[in-house]
Interface confidence: low
């Protein structure tokens, strides 16, 4: 019967934020500047991610966690951990897997992101179309034709454009 031995790895005592320095008798040394170790027992520290160009720093690198990036205004993140920045679409477009595409006829998008939505069907409410829809704007419904007296005008201007995720005041 051969007894198995349990060997304690001296590096396992090194906490996050340090590395097991083989050049110094496996002493736990702090990660150098601009590097990190997110788990204990590591023999090297990883280099911090740098957020440059269209990337913007969301969270700074620390000795125990990598930097996190997001995108400058006008762009949005794609991929795990914001590995890419993709340009926002324009009003009248929607984002597809092949990039920004114009809204199909009969749909609109008044935001710089999101999906194209169908124009309102005025006739469902017994109303008529006062202002035709566009790729960027919904139709404007008005009274039914029978309700319009000669000379009467009740055209409503289209709603103002909205920025992504917001309707400005």
């Amino acid at each position: 019967f051969e007894r198995t031995r349990s060997l304690q790895d001296p590096c396992s005592n090194c906490p996050a934020g340090t590395f097991c320095d083989n050049n110094r008798n496996q002493i736990c040394s702090p990660c150098p500047p601009n590097s990190f170790s997110s788990a204990g027992g590591q023999r090297t520290c990883d280099i911090c991610r740098q957020c440059k160009g269209v990337f913007r720093t969301r969270k700074e690198c620390s000795s125990t966690s990598n930097a996190e990036c997001d995108c400058t205004p006008g762009f949005h993140c794609l991929g795990a951990g914001c590995s890419m920045c993709e340009q926002d679409c324009k009003q009248g477009q929607e984002l597809t897997k092949k990039g920004c595409k114009d809204c199909c006829f009969g749909t609109f998008n008044d935001q710089k992101r999101g999906i194209c939505r169908p124009w309102t069907n005025c006739s469902l409410d017994g109303k008529s179309v006062l202002v035709n829809g566009t790729k960027e704007r919904d139709v404007v419904c008005g009274p039914s034709p029978a309700d319009l007296s000669p000379g009467a005008s009740s055209v409503t201007p289209p709603a103002p454009a909205r920025e992504p995720g917001h309707s400005p005041q």
Epitope: H76, Q111, G114, I115, R117, G165
Partner: antibody, heavy 121, light 107 residues
Framework: EVQLVESGGGLVQPGGSLRLSCAAS?????????WDWIRQAPGKGLEWVSS????????YYADSVKGRFTISRDNSKNTLYLQLNSLRAEDTAVYYC?????????????WGQGTLVTVSS | DIQLTQSPSSLSASVGDRVTITCRAS??????LAWYQQKPGKAPKLLIY???SLESGVPSRFSGSGSGTDFTLTISSLQPEDFATYYC?????????FGQGTKVEIK
Amino acid sequence: EVQLVESGGGLVQPGGSLRLSCAASGYSISSGYYWDWIRQAPGKGLEWVSSISGDGDTTYYADSVKGRFTISRDNSKNTLYLQLNSLRAEDTAVYYCAREYYGYGYALDYWGQGTLVTVSS
Amino acid sequence: DIQLTQSPSSLSASVGDRVTITCRASQGISSYLAWYQQKPGKAPKLLIYDASSLESGVPSRFSGSGSGTDFTLTISSLQPEDFATYYCQQYYSTPLTFGQGTKVEIK
């Protein structure tokens, strides 16, 4: 690490005013994110109140506070403000400031601990 | 305004259970949805953004799915620290709106 600390809450009579502050550290509020106020009435859910863009040029308000509340910021102090005027009993809530993280959209990734506003006579 | 309806409003579960919370939007919001956890007396904490992206530092037992109008938050194996109230939030358009919350209690 981004930290947000609210202050300025307290007891105020209906019709009164308060100014809430949100001091940010670890990140410049002028760096292009949106900064928000969200409130939570006692025992109730969360309600978005207002947002201000990173450049301070654009502000947004919930209909329930429009014309009564004003959001602003002071870049030199790295502080966000919410001026509360014409307060009503239904404005009683814990007010949180938060940062909107712009990934594919805007989610609220950092929150302060909140400050309680009580409107009562 | 876009309404978000969470279900159930409360649930009782045991440690180790798989828990699912749903959030339904009154209109399509693509993937512009986040999930938050809130404990009594504390600020909400972001768990999931863009419907399925796990926030940094959040345990992998939390996951989100869905697009359009129907979304789900799943906790694969409930832990003692997970007993809290969970909120969904849409950021497709203003006003930014939240679901009414789902309270997860100990059975």
